[in-house]
């Protein structure tokens, strides 16, 4: 539970943080999980111990493994494991999956890309920003902070960016990179008022008597996630539960589908043991959303039975 | 129509509409209002059947429709009555596949006047 995956490139700085928190007060020891031997707490060292970070400067394919680190107080001691892997820098564009930090969305109205894990370094202002490897030019393109904005965020924005930074420790300087995949959502969503697709207005549906039958009532509502949206049967002009036919019976539950994009519901009317009472009502499929409310209905005929050749 | 009438600011009255000549269910109805120069709005609307509703915007919270299947009458209940809510307020209705504000509505009250003073 108290285990952090921290990845890195040799010859880049490297620094982790104890997934045991504490208060700042409070000392924190390092370990080589393997040997169980302590890791200096001096600058001097390229890897060393400073408070809840361990920092690898620079890293080297060598130190992979896992690392122990003990939040020690007055009262009790919290051990955490850091399990650290050092890759070999690539000699192609390409960033492997196992290299890649969170993949984040934007939008249109929201394009905020953090650089991750930079609050762990001493780093100075500018970012420089990469996209496939090329660097970002052009006005659409900011670096603010420790984040890069993207004016009018389009489709194709899409991919991994990385973000280099120079980490400064005691006047020496270490160079960091890292990426983390960028997809676009599409919030042109849009609500209209419903539209039915089954049944059509005023279908007569052949059932056989005796036989079970079901009707679909389905609707549509519009692009993306839709907010008071609803599909549902009437018999007569009242709802299932108050008619009191018992063979006559709203599926639970509402089948929500993706249609080309559009957001569509459907319930199905489960009628059992059809009698001929049942050809004299009106059922009436229902959509409603926030725009209104629309109504298709439906009449049942008899299934002439299929004549048998002797 | 019927429950219109003079309200000051704050105020409450209810507005019923009873239907003759046709089965109360799978209607949609509504009320409307129309204050003087302005254009006809639709301020509630209703789905007798299964009690759907639908508000304006500047009616949510105050102002509740009703159905009394029984006695086949519509209502609403206004409350927080505010000058601006003063018009002349129809009942409609419509048979037709559609529900809601707006809609066209086939059948339509003479009206009763609402005037709210502050």
């Known amino acids: 539970k108290f285990s952090k995956q921290s990845w890195g490139l040799e010859n880049e700085a490297l620094i982790v943080r104890c997934p045991r928190q504490g208060k700042p007060s409070y000392t924190v020891d390092w370990y080589y999980s393997q040997t169980n031997k302590s890791i200096p707490t001096q600058e001097r060292n390229r890897v060393f111990a400073s408070g809840q970070l361990l920092k690898f400067l620079p890293a080297a394919v060598a130190d992979s493994g896992i690392y122990t680190c003990i939040v020690r107080s007055p009262t009790f001691n919290r051990t955490g494991y850091a399990n650290v892997t050092i890759y070999k820098k690539q000699s192609d564009c390409n960033v492997p999956d196992y290299l890649m930090y969170s993949t984040v969305s934007g939008s249109e109205k929201n394009s905020k890309i953090y650089c991750p894990t930079i609050d762990l370094y001493n780093w100075t202002a500018p970012l420089e920003w990469f996209k496939n490897c090329q660097a970002l030019q052009g006005s659409r393109y900011r670096a603010h902070k420790s984040f890069l904005v993207i004016d009018n965020v389009m489709t194709e924005d899409a991919g991994d960016y990385t973000c280099k930074f120079i980490h400064n420790e005691n006047g020496a300087n270490y160079s960091v990179t890292a990426t983390r995949s960028f997809t676009v959502k599409d919030e042109q969503g849009f609500s209209l008022f419903p539209v039915i697709g089954a049944p059509a207005q005023n279908e007569i549906k052949e059932v056989e008597i005796g036989k079970n039958a079901n009707l679909t009532c389905s609707a549509c509502f519009g692009k993306g996630t839709q907010f008071l949206a609803a599909v549902l049967w009437q018999l007569n002009g009242t709802k299932i539960t108050d008619f009191g036919e018992p063979r006559i019976q709203q599926e639970e539950g509402q089948n929500q589908s993706f249609s080309n994009g559009l957001a569509c519901l459907d319930m199905v009317l489960r009628i059992a043991d059809v009698k001929e009472e049942d050809l004299l009502l009106q059922y009436d499929c229902l959509a409603l959303n926030l725009h209104g409310l629309r109504r298709h209905t439906v009449r049942l005929s008899r299934k002439n039975p299929s004549k048998e050749c002797f | 129509e019927s429950g219109g009438g003079s309200v000051q600011s704050g105020g409450s009255l209810r507005l019923s509409c009873a239907a003759s000549?046709?089965?109360?269910?799978?209607?949609?109805m509504g009320w409307f209002r129309q204050a003087p120069g302005k254009e006809r709005e639709g301020v509630a609307v209703?789905?007798?059947?299964?009690?759907?509703?639908y508000y304006a915007d500047s009616v949510k919270g105050r102002f509740t429709i009703s159905q009394d299947n029984a006695k086949k009458t519509l209502y609403l209940q206004m409350n927080s009555l505010k000058p601006e809510d003063t018009a002349l307020y129809y009942c409609?209705?419509?048979?037709?596949?559609?529900?809601?504000?707006?809609?066209?509505?086939?059948?339509w009250g003479q009206g009763t006047q609402v005037t709210v003073s502050s």
């Open positions: 409609a209705a419509d048979s037709g596949p559609l529900c809601g504000l707006g809609i066209q509505f086939g059948y």
């Open positions: 209703l789905y007798t059947g299964v009690d759907i509703t």
């Open positions: 000549g046709y089965t109360f269910r799978r209607y949609c």
